[in-house]
């Protein structure tokens, strides 16, 4: 479920609202040349969103995108 | 810098078992999703397991009730338990850290008679 034409994007914050989970159509993660680890959530409504990848939910939206039927 | 050592593979027979090992430095396993993809000969790498830092887990259906992948957090450690193989499961298994685009040298797993 990961774009192929991924942009070069980094994350310098992090949400601090967890985003309803319905809200999400797609992710990618950020390069390892960013000073920290992020995943960016693609909304329904074409909205980017950086997200703490140590955040629990954070895991369980990206591991359901692609292993959930 | 993230370090990511998988070992375990070999060559082992229909119906058979192994255990790969994921050996991590750099990063404490147990505050990510810790993934193992695998990647046949000219095919594209697929994921086939996760596991959270809570420990829900997910599984590709191919490999549903033959692989369980669990953690070590004492050692840094996660695991692939790889059991009723089939000649299909035969490719090089990686583990990944979500956020972290490092890949190891994968271990060679071949399903053979």
């Known amino acids: 479920s990961l774009a192929a034409d991924t942009p070069t994007a980094c994350c310098f914050s992090y949400t601090s609202r967890q985003i309803p989970q319905n809200f999400i159509a797609d992710y990618f993660e950020t390069s390892s040349q960013c000073s920290k680890p992020g995943v960016i959530f693609l909304t329904k409504r074409s909205r980017q969103v950086c997200a703490d990848p140590s955040e629990e939910w954070v895991q369980k939206y990206v591991s359901d995108l692609e292993l959930s039927a | 810098e993230v370090q990511l050592v998988e070992s375990g593979g070999g060559l082992v027979q229909p119906g058979g078992s192994l255990r790969l090992s994921c050996a991590a430095s750099g990063i404490i396993t147990s505050r990510y999703l810790m993934r193992w993809y695998r990647q046949a000969p000219g095919e594209q790498r697929e994921l086939v397991a996760d596991?959270?830092?809570?420990?829900?887990?997910n599984y590709r259906d191919s490999v549903k009730g033959r692989f369980t992948i669990s953690r070590d957090n004492a050692k840094n450690t996660v695991y692939l338990q790889m059991n009723s193989l089939k000649p299909e499961d035969t490719a090089v298994y990686y583990c990944?850290?979500?956020?972290?685009?490092?890949w190891g040298q994968g271990t060679q797993v071949t399903v053979s008679s």
């Open positions: 990944k850290a979500l956020g972290f685009d490092r």
């Open positions: 596991i959270t830092s809570g420990g829900s887990t």
